[in-house]
Amino acid sequence: EEELQVIQPEKSVSVAAGDSATLNCTVSSLIPVGPIQWFRGAGPGRELIYNLKEGHFPRVTAVSDPTKRNNMDFSIRISNITPADAGTYYCVKFRKGSPDVELKSGAGTELSVRAKPSAPVVSGPAVRATAEHTVSFTCESHGFSPRDITLKWFKNGNELSDVQTNVDPAGKSVSYSIRSTARVLLTRRDVHSQVICEVAHVTLQGDPLRGTANLSEAIRVPPFLEVTQQSMRADNQVNVTCQVTKFYPQRLQLTWLENGNVSRTEMASALPENKDGTYNWTSWLLVNVSAHRDDVKLTCQVEHDGQPAVNKSFSVKVSAHPKEQGSNTAAENTGTNERGSSDYKDDDDKHHHHHH
């Protein structure tokens, strides 16, 4: 009796998820009579994939008609492949019996499943950070196979280098996930900036997937404050202006204080946007000089985006204003707190206690 050979010609087969996989197997002889079974894995824990003789295997079909005379082709086709189908498949010949007796196994065919990564999801910090600070963005993509994958970060088209990336799990798996964190330095010009997480994988045929996040969701650009006085009006009223410039987001509350007492509170709304995405706002306060015997200390107090208030004070010297009509003498500006461009500075009223 000639020695039966079970031939699995392919050592490995790679299939895209959703496609069908054909696993080839032929036997060298019609002898002995008995069925072919397909298993995934070897040993006692192997999983039955197809049994020509009996069972219901809805995703598996025989490539050749098993009833065909002289049939020695026992290849199978598995439909709608998912990453969970990855593994080594063995074509095993049995000798007819009660029960059938395992006779010989093929060498096995390793099925690897090429699964596309999910669309990258980029998430930024939970709370806004002030310009000139560094924030972290994370990018996640799941369900891909094989494990090899490339992830790059870009900010406004420029690749970022302060990046940490992990692919899990480290060992063999049916599919993998990638998680990457990029640290991004925010600048005052970043309101319209965007970070992009770009994922390249063999399944994507050179057309990488991208996830984006707008820095406008993550950034806070604190305002510049400037308090100025217009010329004395004929009715002895001084028009004092508080210019709040280059801030983002728009959420801002401005309070005028006269000698420490609240005079008026305003909320910014429907402001026009600057080219760089920031906002400007100007508030005016009319001070009736003739109603005051002493100098008037005016404070423009700005609370931006829930941060501690920033103050800018200005003293109107009543003594410097002749009461006659038409005087152009300017009140003296005794404000000493010019704010810097990067962070809140303590002002002369010491209202600001926190730095971010």
Epitope: L30, V33, E54, G55, A62, P66, T67, R69, N70, N71
Partner: antibody, heavy 119, light 110 residues
Framework: QVQLVQSGAEVKKPGASVKVSCKAS????????INWVRQAPGQGLEWIAM????????HYNQIFKDRATLTTDTSTSTAYMELRSLRSDDTAVYYC????????????WGRGTLVTVSS | DIVLTQSPDSLAVSLGERATINCRAS??????????IFWYQQKPGQPPKLLIY???NRDSGVPDRFSGSGSGTDFTLTISSLQAEDVAVYYC????????FGQGTKLEIK
């Protein structure tokens, strides 16, 4: 375990028809040929025909091709053999048999159905 | 059509002795490297049982005292040492074309 269970004995008059059933279990019915063989009393085996349940392909012995019809019902894994225009020499035990190796052989057999044709 | 002729029609052999049954085909039954001959045993009141397939291969569970041989047109079933339970009618069958049976050989104990 492969089992082929046949219908009970029949007595028919000449000229009538008979339909014998064979219910299969213990294997995937559509993956193997079913043969029909008869044996007249004290005589040898005579092959009638075979059917592939997956697509109803049939092969008939020329002697029977005008009188015998094989069918299957895959929903119940049952094969049928109908023989028409019965004569007294059709009296025989009719066997169904499953071809396990697709070798056009008969590996597993039913117990047989005795059909008696008598006026 | 291929015609199979068995010889002898009947045979009586002593227990423990060798029994030999022949089957001759009217034309060669060899095809695709195989001899398409099968041997069956039928005991009274029972359906036939497959003994040998493709001329020389014992079916599962068949005692090794049964063997088949031959090629082309001439084939032999041999029982090396007859046992009482081997009393039966033996049939050859070919399937190079569609199945046909030989007329049968009745084996008895001498």
């Amino acid at each position: 375990q492969v089992q082929l269970v046949q219908s009970g004995a029949e007595v028919k008059k000449p000229g009538a028809s008979v339909k014998v059933s064979c219910k299969a279990s213990g294997y995937t019915f559509t993956n193997y040929w079913i043969n029909w063989v008869r044996q007249a009393p004290g005589q040898g085996l005579e092959w009638i025909a075979m059917i592939d349940p997956s697509d109803s392909e049939t092969h008939y012995n020329q002697i029977f091709k005008d009188r015998a019809t094989l069918t299957t019902d895959t929903s119940t894994s049952t094969a049928y053999m109908e023989l028409r225009s019965l004569r007294s020499d059709d009296t025989a035990v009719y066997y169904c048999a499953m071809d396990y190796g697709s070798l056009y052989a008969m590996d597993y057999w039913g117990r047989g159905t005795l059909v008696t044709v008598s006026s | 059509d291929i015609v199979l002729t068995q010889s002898p029609d009947s045979l009586a052999v002593s227990l423990g002795e060798r029994a030999t049954i022949n089957c001759r085909a009217s034309q060669s039954v060899r095809s695709s490297g195989y001899n398409w001959i099968f041997w069956y045993q039928q005991k009274p009141g029972q359906p036939p049982k497959l003994l040998i397939y493709l001329a020389s291969n014992r079916d599962s569970g068949v005692p090794d005292r049964f063997s088949g041989s031959g090629s082309g047109t001439d084939f032999t079933l041999t029982i090396s040492s007859l046992q009482a339970e081997d009393v039966a009618v033996y049939y050859c069958q070919e399937s190079r074309e569609l199945p046909t049976f030989g007329q049968g050989t009745k084996l008895e104990i001498k």
